[in-house]
Amino acid sequence: AAIGSCSKEYRVLLGQLQKQTDLMQDTSRLLDPYIRIQGLDVPKLREHCRERPGAFPSEETLRGLGRRGFLQTLNATLGCVLHRLADLEQRLPKAQDLERSGLNIEDLEKLQMARPNILGLRNNIYCMAQLLDNSDTAEPTKAGRGASQPPTPTPASDAFQRKLEGCRFLHGYHRFMHSVGRVFSKW
């Protein structure tokens, strides 16, 4: 739940949600730093860094949901993302190791800032859900499918495969955030 008073103005809150999703959709925020840190910044390897179909709800699926259902799906999916991010963070090199290998410490910072960014967005989603629940003209909830389970990685036999899985997952996350932004823009 959000701490402090949620904004009671629909337009203001929607504008903030749009700003947050716009800022989070770009791959320079998460995927690109991950690729550099994991040594996957090679054209041949980048080809393998494509989202697995079905890992995240499609834009078409999101558009088909009612507003409440969309927010529920978004909240649940971001919850899954947080779990995966925690897993990815555990496998990242430490700051001192990065410096020793000549990699950019700012890349690690960007990866670490993703989690609080998502938490902040989720709090605004909670505020918007509250606002919709309190409005007289709220539509009935149309629950979203496919967001209750975290996008699970395929069993990885080695560290390299896990890196690629992480890459594919983050690619899907950015595509998903782009879709979310497009849905919000139609509200």
């Epitope: 402090g4 947050q20 800022l23 791959t27 700012e106 960007k110 670490q112 938490l119």
Partner: antibody, heavy 119, light 113 residues
Amino acid sequence: EVQLVQSGAEVKKPGESLKISCKGSGYSFTSYWISWVRQMPGKGLEWMGIIYPGDSYTRYSPSFQGQVTISADKSISTAYLQWSSLKASDTAMYYCARVPVSPAYLDYWGQGTLVTVSS
Amino acid sequence: DIVMTQSPDSLAVSLGERATINCKSSQSVLGSSSNINFLAWYQQKPGQPPKLLIYSASTRESGVPDRFSGSGSGTDFTLTISSLQAEDVAVYYCQQYFSTPITFGQGTKVEIK
């Protein structure tokens, strides 16, 4: 209405400690980050660091790392900037500002807290 | 760190005339996939905190008069005040938020000629 209200002006002596505050209202405090920005007399803006009040995750500018401490108490929607030992060169206006995600632009600013350090 | 350099340091413009401020970043602040430039402009009037005018290089913050516009991409950006008003006398700053640490330009002072 979104508001960031900062604590009042301070006059301190070198070596003294200080903690200034920034209270947010009119929005969900844990939906955004809070940045601190320094403006020395007649000079430009310098970013000091940022905190996510939800879990107090903090990032400092290398120029300010170890010089100040940024903290937050989400239960009272307040962020803090503190010094353990002030120097004359810390004399400046300090602003807190709200940030949608990190890093990003600063969309709402506090009115500023003037800190004067003089013997 | 990304270094932001503004020009000129100050300019004097007649009321109703156009004012143009430039900002150059030491590396590109253009996003990889979204075509968003992570650049903002602020206005600071004497004795007041800065105020956000423009973000994403060209998007006006709500409530900002349409005489203010932003343009540019990559490393070169411009803030334009199409018809200077007396209340526009201020210092203007650009800021990049492509990466931390967030950095500001040194500021451009706009005065009435």
